[in-house]
């Protein structure tokens, strides 16, 4: 069929979306590519309820989400409107800090150890979360 009725193996279903939680780290762009290879995207947090769900699964670990300002304004990777949407930044974040000495500022958003968001250098190898909508991708096959 053309519509997925259940999540792929090792993905977690929640509110008509499927989530995959990595257990190793990658730069933001590599994590983004890995999600796209699976017809998914880095997680887009649209509500406090979704925030709590993701936070529960990742624990107190820095984890990339699908939010960045590499081209100027903050943007969600799936086109969800940033200005009117859900936000959960840490106090005084995002700050585009240049003091890390790695060159440039901070253009990619991640969950911090308490779940609130911070902007950081996109090259840092953090864990990541992929998300895909249940009615978007093709039907899940049996394991080969």
């Amino acid at each position: 069929g053309s519509e997925r009725t259940c999540c792929p193996v090792n993905w977690v279903e929640h509110e008509r979306s499927c989530y995959w939680f990595s257990r190793s780290g990658k730069a933001w762009a590599d994590a983004d590519n890995y999600c796209r290879l699976e017809d998914a995207h880095l997680v887009v947090v649209t509500s406090w309820e979704e925030q709590k769900f993701v936070q529960h699964h990742i624990g107190p670990v820095n984890t990339w989400m699908g939010l960045h300002d590499q081209n100027g304004p903050w943007k969600w990777v799936d086109g969800t409107d940033y200005e009117t949407g859900f936000k959960n930044w840490r106090p005084e974040q995002p700050d585009d800090w240049y003091g890390h000495g790695l060159g440039g500022g901070e253009d990619c958003a991640h969950f911090t150890d308490d779940g609130r968001w911070n902007d950081d250098v996109c090259q840092r190898p953090y864990r990541w979360v992929c998300e895909t909508e249940l009615d978007k991708a093709s039907q899940e096959p049996p394991l080969l």
Epitope: P8, V9, D30, N33, R36, A137, S138
Partner: antibody, heavy 122, light 107 residues
Amino acid sequence: EVQLLESGGGLVQPGGSLRLSCAASGFTFSSYAMSWVRQAPGKGLEWVSAISGSGGNTFYADSVKGRFTISRDNSKNTLYLQMNSLRAEDTAVYYCAKLGRIAVTGPYFDYWGQGTLVTVSS
Amino acid sequence: DIQMTQSPSSVSASVGDRVTITCRASQAINDWLAWYQQKPGKAPKLLIYAASSFQSGVPSRFSGSGSGTDFTLTITSLQPEDFATYYCQQASSFPFTFGPGTKVDIK
């Protein structure tokens, strides 16, 4: 049993075009990312391109970007590689390969076709 | 791009020998590494993925280890059908890259 069968290779002049096909069977084709990998005569392996299961996301090696286009027809269980502006250095055996799922094994080339030879020469 | 190197480039061995091939990545790739076997005129075959996991049907004499930048493929007791070229490949980031290969031939 997973099977991948490439076709479309042959002799082409520099600057010419060729379209490779890969017919897939034995798995749910639309659920897996696919890739092309090439091997120049007597040389090692070089990843060329990859495409997600839906065909909505594509990835290319810098050496072919802008010249090659990967695509797929899930209704026909077929993967394609359109090769334009071919150069002598594109001469190679081109393999079609299935990619494993990131959440199961990781995106490794778990099944390969037998390859089709592309020769670019005047 | 992540560069992959292998050593040795070739090794001569006898049936029953233990053969060790090493692979090094130019930057850390965690365990996003695979090993492939290729025989002349044939397509490569996946042996090991995620640095140390066996692909289905691969004999237990093959094993992989390592993490970060340094990896090893070991064949504990070389069999006649193991004479081939072995490639490592990183799947940590695009573009996926392969090592130059290690040819295992008969001494």
